[in-house]
């Protein structure tokens, strides 16, 4: 425990030092005798509420509202040209595509492309040189159980987010699955039993890992439920950075 | 951390009595600072409902007990000066803040700050130079449904972990949401129908992505349910590393 | 898509991506390991197969990654679990799933959890379920440190190169 690291390393304390040591020791003992039982009792008293009162939403409504704004317009800055001129990197943020699809924004807000990386929704992300890249992705999902059903839980939905290599220099073969994550959500039906929509649920499916990529290979994200993607700011993004 | 605000502000203590008083006071304070958190963590570790081992026996009891100790004292090392001296990086580990808040530890255990990165709970993480940073965060949550309710599932709770930028070159405006994860948990009520607390649930909300930051901008974590954070080792952390 | 069912695609086995010589920059220590799909009741890490590799000093010994030089490393790992729906007659048993990356170092007398995630899963009546856990962070590591993983729920792992992996790279 923490106290074990507190052993004295100096020589023997004498005279006045002994008195100080005695005072320190006594004080420490008394403090321990008082502090430990009181703390034990306090913690035991608090544990149930602490673990159980968990169901109320304590989130600051202001913060929530701000988060909920999604793509609020911020003063747009061009990424400075002098930032990391030699490092192929990209960060793309999810944006709704016509027809309920998931598209990606490469220049707005926090998104950027550096050092020759190229991106478009149709082509995906192309890295400008051979190398070892750390690829990452997070997709936020949201939804609610549709009306109906006798059980308190609706039909499960399994959300998958996957990162593939395809096209370009990789060629026309089967796109190669690089990294993927998945989450099964079982929405709660209308708790009031009014056969209405269930409460909103949220989840995020994310991952990241090292992949050796060649110049001209393309990387793209594939998701199972584009209609459930949460486009609120910061929730859905993917990117790459060369690390070797 | 909570203790950091306890620095003495008074003038110099004089005379032998003053010295004894100072020693007694300091010893008492140090003992309290060690005893109270250690006792809290020990009690939390031992309270039955607090660990998942009671819900299923697939969890390694040894590992569980070890996790439950949270901040047990490890041989503290100064980060070596020769470790990547030019690379601004930080890894901060979640620690309980007075009043059920989420604080961050910057020097204990695996936590570190290198190359001019600065951190305080009040102001967040400040990076020393312009650049491209990979920012990451993982917050472990835990809880149990409170007693009561006719349905087998309790009220849903949506857990959010968010990373914001503020201050510095970014200016005094609204903090900017950079990255965010969310997870809706619907706790299962007492399966035995005894109107007791439901079984413990666990989840983690994490993310990571590239962000272009300017010197002096501050990055901080905001979470929806600080009372539900799991402080077991390795569960809750955030950090940044400059990649270009 | 290939692997939509979270299984290795034919493409992965048919066309292994050749390793490239990174002539443009000095190699940095890096590793990416995948769970061995042939071992169903344990999580054994494999290198030098599919997209897994060990680079510039990293080695794999006793299912642990050995850190080649002191420095700051980004360490990451992912697992994906799956399971079947329970039958209406059965009592749904909660399932405890956990994944942890641990550090074993000469400086500590025990394995230190670096990255840890837990989940209680309540299998539903209707469909099979999937759950992934990913985490990654930067750590100051010392030459000779060992990085390993501990997983609860191994029988439920979906072992494929895209779903179960463990890696690290020097920054």
């Amino acid at each position: 425990m923490g106290a074990l690291g507190l052993e004295g390393r100096g020589g023997r304390l004498q005279g006045r030092g002994s008195l100080l040591l005695a005072v320190a020791g006594a004080t420490s003992l008394v403090t321990l005798l008082l502090a430990v039982p009181i703390t034990v009792l306090a913690v035991l008293a608090l544990v149930p509420q602490d673990q159980g009162g968990l169901v109320t939403d304590t989130a600051d409504p202001g913060a929530q509202a701000q988060q909920g704004l999604g793509f609020q317009k911020l003063p747009e800055e061009e990424p400075e040209a002098d930032l990391s001129p030699g490092l192929p990197a990209a960060h793309l943020i999810g944006a709704p595509l016509k027809g309920q699809g998931l598209g990606w924004e490469a220049t707005k807000e926090q998104a950027f492309l550096t050092s020759g990386t190229q991106f478009s929704d149709a082509e995906g992300l192309a890295l400008p040189q051979d190398g070892l890249y750390y690829l990452y992705c997070l997709v936020g999902y949201r939804g609610r159980a549709p009306p109906g059903g006798a059980e308190p839980r609706g039909r499960s939905v399994t959300l998958r987010s996957s990162l593939y290599r395809a096209g370009g220099a990789y060629g026309p073969g089967t796109p190669e699955l690089l990294l993927e994550g998945a989450e099964t959500v079982t929405p709660v039906l209308d708790p009031a039993g009014r056969q209405g929509y269930g409460p909103l649920w949220y989840t995020s499916v994310g991952f990241g890992g090292l992949v050796q990529l060649r110049r001209g290979e393309r990387v793209y994200v594939n998701i199972s439920h584009p209609d459930m993607v949460d486009f609120a700011r910061g929730k859905t993004f993917f990117g790459a950075v060369m690390v070797g | 951390m909570g203790a950091l605000g306890l620095e003495g502000r008074g003038g110099r203590l004089q005379g032998r009595g003053s010295l004894l008083l100072a020693v007694a006071g300091a010893t008492s304070l140090v003992t309290l600072l060690l005893a109270v958190p250690i006792t809290v963590l020990a009690v939390l570790a031992l309270v039955p409902q607090d660990q998942g081992g009671l819900v299923t026996d697939t969890a390694d009891p040894g590992a569980q007990a070890q996790q439950g100790l949270g901040f047990q004292k490890l041989p503290e090392e100064e980060p070596e000066a020769d470790l990547s001296p030019g690379l601004p990086a930080a890894h901060l580990i979640g620690a309980p803040l007075k009043g059920q808040g989420l604080g961050w530890e910057a020097t204990k255990e695996q936590a570190f700050l290198t190359s001019g990165t600065q951190f305080s709970d009040a102001e967040g993480l400040a990076l020393p130079q312009d650049g491209l940073y990979y920012l990451y965060c993982l917050v472990g949550y835990r809880g149990r449904a409170p007693p009561g309710g006719a349905e087998p599932r309790g009220r849903s709770v949506t857990l959010r972990s968010s990373l914001y930028r503020a201050g510095g070159a970014y200016g005094p405006g609204t903090p900017e949401l950079l990255l965010e994860g969310a997870e809706t948990v619907t706790p299962v009520l007492d399966p035995a129908g005894r109107q007791g607390y439901g079984p413990l649930w666990y989840t983690s909300v994490g993310f990571g992505g590239l962000v272009q930051l300017r010197r002096g901008e501050r990055v901080y974590v905001n979470i929806s349910h600080p009372d539900m954070v799991d402080f077991a080792r390795g569960k809750t952390f955030f950090g940044a590393v400059m990649v270009g | 898509l290939p692997g939509v069912g979270l299984t290795p695609s034919a493409a992965q086995t048919a066309r292994q991506h050749p390793k490239m010589h990174l002539a443009h920059s000095t190699l940095k220590p890096a590793a990416h390991l995948i769970g061995d799909p042939s071992k169903q009741n344990s999580l054994l890490w494999r290198a030098n197969t599919d997209r897994a590799f060990l680079q510039d000093g990293f080695s794999l010994s006793n299912n642990s990654l050995l850190v080649p030089t002191s420095g700051i490393y980004f360490v990451y790992s992912q697992v994906v679990f799956s399971g079947k729906a329970y039958s209406p007659k059965a009592t749904p048993t909660p399932l405890y799933l956990a994944h942890e990356v641990q550090l074993f170092s000469s400086q500590y007398p025990f394995h230190v959890p670096l990255l840890s995630s837990q989940k209680m899963v309540y299998p539903g009546l209707q469909e099979p379920w999937l759950h992934s856990m990913y985490h990654g962070a930067a750590f100051q590591l010392t030459q000779g440190d060992q990085l390993s993983t501990h997983t609860d729920g191994i029988p439920h792992l979906v072992l494929s190169p895209s779903t179960v992996f463990f890696g690290a790279f020097a920054l």
């Epitope: 699809g101 096209g167 026309p172 796109p175 594939n222 439920h225 584009p226 | - | 898509l1």
Partner: antibody
Framework: EVQLQQSGPELVKPGASVKISCKAS????????MNWMRQSHGKSLEWIGR????????FYNQKFKDKATLTVDKSSTTAHMELLSLTSEDSAVYYC?????????WGQGTSVTVSS | DIQMTQTTSSLSASLGDRVTISCRAS??????LTWYQQKPDGTVKLLIY???KLHSGVPSRFSGSGSGTDYSLTISNLEPGDIATYYC?????????FGGGAKLEIK
């Protein structure tokens, strides 16, 4: 063996719509994107758009966004293209082609003639 | 949109000849160039992707080269089965566009 079998020729009146199909076999249908092209008589090829059979996401050449609607039926491993408000300008041979960008297999083509 | 120009719309050559068909893009397409062969019956086949990579099953008599905006397809040792129209296509920037085609005939 990979095959893309397209539906037969169509003769339609101006202003009408037509739905042509491309039946895929011999490979995992959801594993590859499906592209559609058109070739007017004696002219070059034009790329209309592409659909992801896995989730129905589609990309269109802006020129065709109000002309074509791409859909898939996973159960029958068939891709469809509906052509709307046809004019004589839309008379052409329409091809489906499998691939993310380079298309390694093409259908035999479907001839659409718009005439009153 | 990126314009693809095949300056030679038709050419004729003798069996055994070496033939080069060129293609120019209106802007840099970073090697994202594909070549297709369309036979007189309308059948279309992929020959080359990413400027120079030969698609499986395509004879090595076919080769591609180029960079930036200028690309070419070369057929060596011309055979009767090579009679077709050859199209280049850029897949660098959406929407993808094809060249006008080059019709190859045997003298």
């Amino acid at each position: 063996e990979v095959q893309l079998q397209q539906s037969g020729p169509e003769l339609v009146k101006p202003g009408a719509s037509v739905k042509i199909s491309c039946k895929a076999s011999g490979y995992s249908f959801t594993g590859y994107f499906m592209n559609w092209m058109r070739q007017s008589h004696g002219k070059s090829l034009e790329w209309i758009g592409r659909i992801n059979p896995y989730n129905g996401d589609s990309f269109y050449n802006q020129k065709f966004k109000d002309k074509a609607t791409l859909t898939v039926d996973k159960s029958s491993t068939t891709a469809h293209m509906e052509l709307l408000s046809l004019t004589s300008e839309d008379s052409a041979v329409y091809y489906c082609g499998r691939g993310y960008d380079a298309m390694d297999y093409w259908g035999q083509g479907t001839s659409v003639t718009v005439s009153s | 949109d990126i314009q693809m120009t095949q300056t030679t719309s038709s050419l004729s050559a003798s069996l055994g000849d070496r033939v080069t068909i060129s293609c120019r893009a209106s802007q840099d397409i970073s090697n994202f160039l594909t070549w297709y062969q369309q036979k007189p019956d309308g059948t279309v086949k992929l020959l080359i992707y990413y400027t120079s990579k030969l698609h499986s099953g395509v004879p090595s008599r076919f080769s591609g080269s180029g960079s930036g905006t200028d690309y070419s397809l070369t057929i060596s040792n011309l055979e009767p089965g090579d009679i077709a129209t050859y199209y280049c296509q850029q897949v660098s920037k959406f929407p993808w566009t094809f060249g006008g085609g080059a019709k190859l005939e045997i003298k």
